[in-house]
């Protein structure tokens, strides 16, 4: 089974112990270790932030000690814009640019492929998108012609019943891509006024539409439908968890809100926790399990979080083995306890660890 | 090939603060990599007590915590250690390290012998 | 934090015999290094990554294990190998040494 590990290069700048650089990552932990996120600047891939080459180097030089281990760069995210991907795409003579600058800037800096993140094609970009992919295969089957191997295409995808139907022609995608990440979390956030787990494994007993495709369960099943093969679908697994702020003294799933949670001490974005700050926070919270979505959630006086445990990444592995998929993401390396100061095991990429362990279990 | 060299007082008296100095040459702790202190008490038993990152941050041992802490000298391509409170417990061989993989320890100081005594 | 427990804590091998150190761990570990130490010397790093010998290290040296077991093989024991060999792990947070292994030349 594949791990794919992305890794984030903001994390370099969380304060104290939740800085985190591409050195402290386990060499042997992932199959592919996927760096967040490169720029496109004049329709060329570049660097993002001021000591990207660094970094590139430093998470490369973990292939020196496994050899087995492959780096992929991704292009986009959030901060990038669907935009500035549309203009690059819809356009012939930019796309063309944007293409042939990535091997030989994958190559120069260490990396064995490429991960498109473009969050995401809007409806008119659909064929775009799938021209982006097709031509972009194209060109790294012929680069490798010289007996090079041959760099890996892959793409994270959303998760989400109206992205997916306005945003990708799955079958199509599917032939070009060696492997599809589909972010499976996010798919309960403060803009629903009420609790609800981001990342649930099944739909909850009360999801009524449009509620009942906001699960991982609906989106693998809704993408195999599609065309996608189980070979070369990833399932999403987060290390992170989203909350809450609570508006009265309900506490269950789908109780109301009144905002994002507080932020984190080291992420510093409401509504988000990294795992490691969820260690801390469960000190003296209340933990719940939401039986039929096999996902946890936990309170403390007006906070709720919903994430993501070693018991339930074991139940989406153990579900993704059952579908047959080719494997599993994590996002992010950054975000676990990647110390193993916070979660009181002491071990190193806890969460990790834990969809390792369950995709190599008989 | 990079070369580190402890330096500091062999004698402190207990409840003092220990200091120690790491050398670096041939290798910028500001290009990459972890600085580590480790000791090795006289009964030979090895304990790692931190480390100063490239990068500045650092991360410490828990059973020291409350009483370490490391800070550098770019600019003489050194990095320190400071251990308040000693004990004759804290009577050591001091080394500094460097790692390759961030989990092991590649090159190592000669070792300075520092005694807590009255 | 994880221990880890070496034994013999001191043998003896006669040249040309084969030699064989484990390490155990308290909890199961990703990889294991090995660090070799002389009297009056830092440590060296020996074998890294469980299995890998670092740059020096003769070939009559290996390493081996998984899970908590990892072992430290000399094929034929040569009295240069004579020393103090210590196991170390970081898989698990703070990092962590075996209180050693004491080979001597019969």
């Known amino acids: 089974y594949k791990l794919v590990c992305y890794y984030t290069s903001w994390s370099q700048y969380r304060e104290g112990d939740g800085s985190c650089f591409p050195d402290a990552l386990d060499r042997f932990l992932c199959t592919h270790i996927i760096y967040s996120f490169a720029n496109i600047s004049n329709d060329h891939i570049d660097t993002w932030e001021w000591n990207d080459v660094t970094l590139y180097g430093m998470l490369n030089t973990l292939k020196n000690r496994n050899p087995n281990l492959k780096t992929l760069l991704s292009v986009g995210g959030w901060n990038f814009g669907s935009q500035r991907f549309s203009k690059i795409a819809s356009n012939t003579q930019s796309r063309r640019t944007f293409i042939k600058s990535v091997p030989p800037f994958l190559r120069t800096h260490g990396f064995d492929g490429l991960d498109l993140a473009w969050l995401y094609p809007g409806r008119r970009d659909k064929q775009h998108f799938t021209t982006l992919i097709k031509e972009m295969k194209a060109e790294f089957i012929k680069e490798a012609q010289p007996g090079k191997k041959q760099l890996l295409l892959s793409a994270a995808l959303s998760a989400g019943k109206v992205t997916i139907d306005s945003s990708y022609d799955i079958a199509k995608i599917s032939q070009h891509l060696d492997f599809i990440s589909i972010m499976t979390y996010d798919f309960h956030g403060a803009w629903r006024g009420t609790t609800g787990h981001h990342s649930p494994l099944f739909r909850g007993q009360e999801d009524a539409s449009p509620d009942r495709f906001s699960n991982t369960d609906y989106a693998v099943g809704y993408m195999l439908r599609l065309g996608a093969p189980a070979s070369k679908l990833v399932m999403g697994i987060p290390t992170f968890g989203r909350s809450f702020t609570l508006a009265s003294s309900e506490t269950g799933v789908g109780a109301p809100i009144s905002g994002p949670g507080i932020p984190g001490r080291f992420t510093k974005e409401a509504g988000t926790l990294a795992y490691y700050e969820i260690c801390d926070f469960l000190r003296g919270a209340t933990v719940h399990r939401i039986l039929g979505q096999q996902v946890p959630y936990a309170t403390k006086g007006n906070q709720w979080v919903g994430y993501d445990d070693q018991e339930s990444v074991k139940s989406k592995v153990q579900y993704l083995k059952d579908r047959q998929l080719a494997g599993a993401m994590v996002w992010a390396l950054d975000l676990d306890d990647f110390q193993g100061s916070f979660c009181g095991q002491d071990l190193r990429f806890p969460l990790t660890n834990a969809i390792k362990d369950a995709l190599a279990a008989t | 090939d990079v070369q580190l060299q402890e330096s500091g007082p062999d004698l402190v008296k207990p409840s003092q603060s220990l200091s120690l100095t790491c050398t670096v040459t041939g290798y910028s702790i500001t290009s990459g990599y972890s600085w580590h202190w480790i000791r090795q008490f006289p009964g030979n038993k090895l304990e790692w007590m931190g480390y100063i990152h490239y990068s500045g941050r650092t991360n410490y041992n828990p059973s020291l915590k409350s009483r370490i802490s490391f800070t550098r000298d770019t600019s003489k391509n050194q990095f320190f250690l400071r251990l308040n409170s000693v004990t004759p417990e804290d009577t050591a061989t001091y080394y500094c390290a460097r790692n390759y993989g961030y989990d092991e320890f590649a090159y190592w100081g000669q070792g300075t012998l520092v005694t807590v005594s009255a | 934090q994880i221990v880890l427990t070496q034994s013999p804590a001191i043998m003896s091998a006669s040249p040309g015999e084969k030699v064989t150190m484990t390490c155990s761990a308290s909890s199961s570990v990703s990889y294991m290094h090995w660090y070799q130490q002389k009297s009056g010397t830092s440590p060296k790093r020996w074998i890294y990554?469980?299995?890998k010998l670092a740059s020096g290290v003769p070939a009559r040296f290996s390493g081996s294990g998984s899970g908590t077991s990892y072992s430290l093989t000399i094929s034929s024991m040569e009295a240069e190998d004579a020393a103090t060999y210590y196991c170390?792990?970081?898989?698990?947070?703070?990092?962590?040494f075996g209180s050693g292994t004491k080979l001597e030349i019969k």
């Open positions: 170390q792990q970081w898989s698990s947070n703070p990092p962590t």
């Open positions: 990554d469980t299995s």
